[in-house]
Interface confidence: low
């Protein structure tokens, strides 16, 4: 019995035309939603004038349907048993699942001012930037609609810059009609224990963002893992959103719509400083902001974002060191709401439910030459928004799964 089932599972999780895995892999059968909470700054003038703590109030959720597009240019390579694809990006606003509209206004850090002052450190260039910031009536903070903040707006300051720069700014710009990849993953035909594991991303086995092992593309994309998952395993996966590979460890047994699944979570150790977790030394890329690599819980991904000072963390700076959140008032981290987890059906290795949570922050630093940043007395890693991307297997699919997979085993 069991051997026959194992054989069937091995056959069905291969990524090739005709298998259950392939059908759901090309186009996810799960509805995936991305909820955003925006950090609305309550005291912009105080911060700019007196370098006060930034008072934020989260507003959300604003919900979008995502990952509804099928993978494109799916190409099998029989020689090395891989399948390549692009993952198209698309987002559709869901008003019924949101607290407001895409036209809602927020007071947020001025992304262009913060980024330009960080990228162009030269004093003379900063003087030029200062005159352009003033001329465009830009400031340290700005009021933007949700749609502008997420998907892009024409920045008045950047529009005045006399040399070629992208004048459109947005946290996820460009998004719609773009694609992530090319991913090349093992299809499992020759070795089922490698199924869905990424061979190359954008044609390379390394990212070129980090030193040493931190730069490796490890594991799958977290949508599935090789079958017959054990609780003792450390599940590695790559997330292009955070420009790195990361891992999850077993936390608990969960019953999901009658299907026994293993809940794997991202442990706090993954976000620790090299002092606590020496493996993380290569994620510490500079010494000043990181206080000589002793700060933790924030990841500087500027190298992956054309030099823009973007820092990724967990929502509300969960698992981050006190010095990171100290200049920000109004944060309230808690594990239940703010950690990332994957619910994996162990026989097939399919992720049947997940919650991927992350926060986008921007570094802003004092600058003698830029008037709107002149009064700052310290560096701030400013939270802009946090997101919760979730998906759960539908009832119909769960029934099918129970009858075809878990029902046969039990």
């Amino acid at each position: 019995g069991d051997l026959l089932i194992q054989k069937t599972i091995k056959k069905q999780v291969v990524l090739e035309e005709g298998t259950i895995a392939f059908k759901n892999w090309v186009k996810t059968g799960t509805e995936v939603y991305r909820q955003f909470w925006i950090f609305d700054v309550q005291n912009p003038q105080e911060v700019m004038m007196n370098s006060s703590n930034i008072q934020v109030k989260q507003r959300g959720p604003y919900t979008y349907r995502v990952r509804f597009l099928a993978k494109e240019n799916v190409t099998q390579d029989a020689e090395d048993n891989t399948v390549s694809f692009l993952q198209p990006n698309g987002a559709i606003f869901e008003p019924s699942l949101s607290v407001g509209t895409e036209a809602d206004n927020f007071t947020v850090l001025n992304l262009a001012v913060a980024a330009a002052s960080h990228i162009y450190q030269n004093q003379f260039v900063q003087m030029i930037l200062n005159s352009l910031i003033n001329k465009s009536k830009s400031s340290m903070f700005q009021v933007r609609t949700l749609r502008e903040l997420l998907w892009g707006y024409r920045d008045p300051f950047l529009s005045l810059v006399p040399y070629p720069v992208t004048t459109t700014v947005g946290l996820f710009y460009p998004y719609n009609n773009t694609a992530d990849g090319v991913y090349k993953v093992f299809n499992g035909k020759d070795n089922i224990s490698k199924v869905a594991i990424i061979d190359t991303y954008k044609g390379k086995r390394n990212l070129s963002y980090w030193e040493s092992h931190c730069d490796m593309i490890n594991g799958t994309d977290a949508a599935s893992f090789p079958p017959f998952v054990e609780k003792s395993q450390v599940l590695q996966f790559f997330s292009s959103d955070i420009c790195r590979s990361i891992y999850a460890v077993f936390e608990s047994d969960v019953n999901l719509k009658g299907i026994p699944v293993y809940r794997f979570v991202l442990p706090s150790k993954a976000f620790a400083s090299p002092v606590e977790n020496p493996d993380n030394y290569c994620f510490c890329t500079e010494k000043i902001i990181s206080k000589n690599c002793t700060s933790y819980g924030v990841l500087d991904i500027s190298k992956c974002k054309e030099g823009r000072p973007v820092y990724i963390s967990l929502p509300h700076f969960l698992y981050a060191s006190p010095d990171v959140s100290e200049p920000i008032d109004g944060l309230n981290p808690n594990e239940e709401e703010h950690r990332t987890y994957l619910d994996i059906e162990p026989i097939t290795g399919f992720t049947l439910q997940f919650a991927k949570r992350l926060q986008v922050n921007l570094l802003v630093k004092p600058s003698e030459k830029i008037q709107v940043l002149k009064n700052l007395k310290r560096n701030y890693i400013v939270p802009i928004l946090w997101l919760n991307e979730t998906g759960t297997i539908g009832d119909e699919k769960a029934n099918m799964f129970r009858s075809q997979v878990t029902g046969k085993i039990n």
Epitope: N73, G181, V182
Partner: nanobody
């Protein structure tokens, strides 16, 4: 193997319309981005526009925006190029194109001639 076959070209008056078709075979058509290119006499082949796999999103070069429309019918494995308000400078051989990600390969049709006369 991948095959792309264009049709619908011909001679047309200035300001007239023409609809080109490209029949595809040898691959799962609905998984692939499809494009149209053209090559005028003595010039390099240039992109006209492309359409994503579902047909939900098409992109065009500035010179044809508002005049040309790309569409596709995944049930017929065919992509179309509707050309309106044709100009003399639209005279060219029009090619249908797709590509595979891995191994990286371009696939072209043999082309269809479009001539716009004044």
């Amino acid at each position: 193997q991948v095959q792309l076959q264009e049709s619908g070209g011909g001679l047309v008056q200035l300001g007239g319309s023409l609809r080109l078709s490209c029949a595809a075979s040898g691959f799962t058509f609905s998984n692939y981005y499809m494009s149209w290119y053209r090559q005028a006499p003595g010039k390099e082949r240039e992109l006209v526009g492309g359409i994503n796999m579902t047909g939900g999103s098409a992109d065009y070069v500035d010179s044809v925006k508002g005049r040309f429309t790309i569409s596709r019918d995944n049930t017929k494995n065919t992509v179309y190029l509707q050309m309106n308000s044709l100009r003399v400078e639209d005279t060219a051989v029009y090619y249908c194109h797709t590509f595979s990600v891995w191994p990286p390969n371009n696939y072209w049709g043999q082309g269809t001639q479009v001539t716009v006369s004044s």
